[in-house]
Interface confidence: medium
Amino acid sequence: SWMWNQFFLLEEYTGSDYQYVGKLHSDQDRGDGSLKYILSGDGAGDLFIINENTGDIQATKRLDREEKPVYILRAQAVNRRTGRPVEPESEFIIKIHDINDNEPIFTKDVYTATVPEMADVGTFVVQVTATDADDPTYGNSAKVVYSILQGQPYFSVESETGIIKTALLNMDRENREQYQVVIQAKDMGGQMGGLSGTTTVNITLTDVNDNPPRFPQSTYQFKTPESSPPGTPIGRIKASDADVGENAEIEYSITDGEGHEMFDVITDQETQEGIITVKKLLDFEKKKVYTLKVEASNPHVEPRFLYLGPFKDSATVRIVVDDVDEPPVFSKLAYILQIREDARINTTIGSVAAQDPDAARNPVKYSVDRHTDMDRIFNIDSGNGSIFTSKLLDRETLLWHNITVIATEINNPKQSSRVPLYIKVLDVNDNAPEFAEFYETFVCEKAKADQLIQTLRAVDKDDPYSGHQFSFSLAPEAASSSNFTIQDNKDNTAGILTRKNGYNRHEMSTYLLPVVISDNDYPVQSSTGTVTVRVCACDHHGNMQSCHAEALIHPTGLSTGA
């Protein structure tokens, strides 16, 4: 039977001669050269050679365990003369023994990692890993230990795991953002003589909101003209924040001051500036200077850093309002005046008043816009604003006069204002009442006495305060007539009545009745109107049949006798 165990061979042999592996030997070998040893399998005849007489095996080349740790070969012992096996073919192993010929190699040449600034000591950053090709099952050739060569006192590494952690409290990104840490991995458990490899870990501190905004100055001053419309930007302020990204976002607000009603602050997202804008119309004459308290604050606050103080800052903004030359201002938006229609020329009606609202209080002059008073009925005193008539008025022609008065600054004629002036002409009883229409009526020849033949109505162009009250009567020359009479109804109407039974159209075909109409205003106005009455032939129903004047005509024409 075969007489050997497995063979062991040290890797990386550096001798000049072949490396002895071991000896194959059969107990059938009598040492007389009758046995021949044959080797086959992994590397036989090339890597491994055998002395066919003695069974000694040698390795012809330097072997690397990391390349191939085990070789499986087959041994044969045959009768040299007959070639017959004297032993059954057997498989055996050559195991390559490890030496520490490989250093640990990191999985990456360079690692990159981030960790928040101000992180607690011991905060995980990143894990690095190195591998060693040597045999981990034998000795310490592959037992790797990690250590930090560069990066202390900021970071530490766990020797067995390669986990890098923060090692210093209050690491501030605003002070230093980038760190280069060098980690060593050493085999042989880190002992002397161990092989090592290194890697670089680039660590960036990420930002947290640990800095409040800060105004670079405590007071700002801006100027704006009083004419600035709402929304006008008048100045920019900027607080700075040492943080970055959303932690550096700043919101501006007006927190106090007498001007928070008049001004606004908006945040320019691009520049992170606070823009002070006009909110309401300003008036230099009312207020010349405003003081605001403006606050810059971080909207994204981390509660754990609130102990550092409020994440906001304040500044005072002083706004000076500049005077703008403004046109004169009338004491009223519109004026309403009254004047009697019988006013004489140059009668004063009333006055308007305007003044320069500016601090200079420039004097003003007044004028009438002639486009609104083409007939030049009115005039104005350019100095005191008194309105007076320059022509006679007639209420019955025009009741209201709507004119425009202009006030102009004497020192600056470009500055002018206009105001409407409504002048009402008051009624005076200067018109007599008259018949509402032309009255021509008829009477039947067979008419009875006290018969109403016509109702009279009157009109008057005047407009008395208490309304019209007309009285009607026959003119004196007809008052004693025995033919017709007039009855005043006391309601601004009157009736013509017959005074006798029967009329003869052949004797008198037409009567002209003079009627006096008076009003009761002051002074009383009256006029005389004529009512024509024709005598007609009528049927028994009183319907006219003929009104032809067949009677003798008086030389004067028609009779005025009533």
């Epitope: 981030t114 990420t206 930002d207 970055v244 990204g245 959303e246 976002e249 700043i250 919101e251 945040t267 997202q269 691009e270 909207p299």
Partner: antibody
Framework: QVQLVESGGGLVKPGGSLRLSCAAS????????ISWVRQAPGKGLEWVGF??????????NYAAPVKGRFTISRDDSKNTLYLQMNSLKTEDTAVYYC???????????WGQGTLVTVSS | DIQMTQSPSSLSASVGDRVTITCRAS??????LNWYQQKPGKAPKLLIY???NLQSGVPSRFSGSGSGTDFTLTISSLQPEDFATYYC????????FGQGTKVEIK
Amino acid sequence: QVQLVESGGGLVKPGGSLRLSCAASGFTFSSYAISWVRQAPGKGLEWVGFIKSNADGYTTNYAAPVKGRFTISRDDSKNTLYLQMNSLKTEDTAVYYCARIRYFRNWDYWGQGTLVTVSS
Amino acid sequence: DIQMTQSPSSLSASVGDRVTITCRASQTINSYLNWYQQKPGKAPKLLIYRASNLQSGVPSRFSGSGSGTDFTLTISSLQPEDFATYYCQQGDSSWTFGQGTKVEIK
């Protein structure tokens, strides 16, 4: 002036993919977080997801209905935002808007929108 | 997730009317409440941010108020161009929108 212009919309079958782009101009694109928002026909607005700026580590976040299917990315050198939509469903049919996220968590500028129709 | 409930869902009003829209959050959102206006076929437009701040270029007839969970958008005198849909949006925890309020002509 600030402008956002979406493109890439169209008709796609359920299960398909589509990539939308949002080209920005008129502002410093790299300083801003940008969001995608969508609006189904006749419906209200729905936030899809956002990507923060370089200063904030290009962090992304997604609404639950699209998480795992949609990916937002950006190319600051091209001033362009992208929305990669995979495994599309019929309920993803909507007009998709990109919007600039302004400070104080509001969106001050929006694109005109691009219509995505998912139908077999 | 924070839910936002807007009321009313629609309203009819005339030009010159004072209009109030309310928005309620399911939990406190500090002041991270924004209001947007959207017209048909257009992108939304920011009106009010952080509950009460008027966005630049937005007419002063729009105003916002509230804190915690209850917020209000007010249009002091409705103009013809204000007929649109209005959305509230919380930004305290990610983002969610209200369902919208449509303001129509009476």
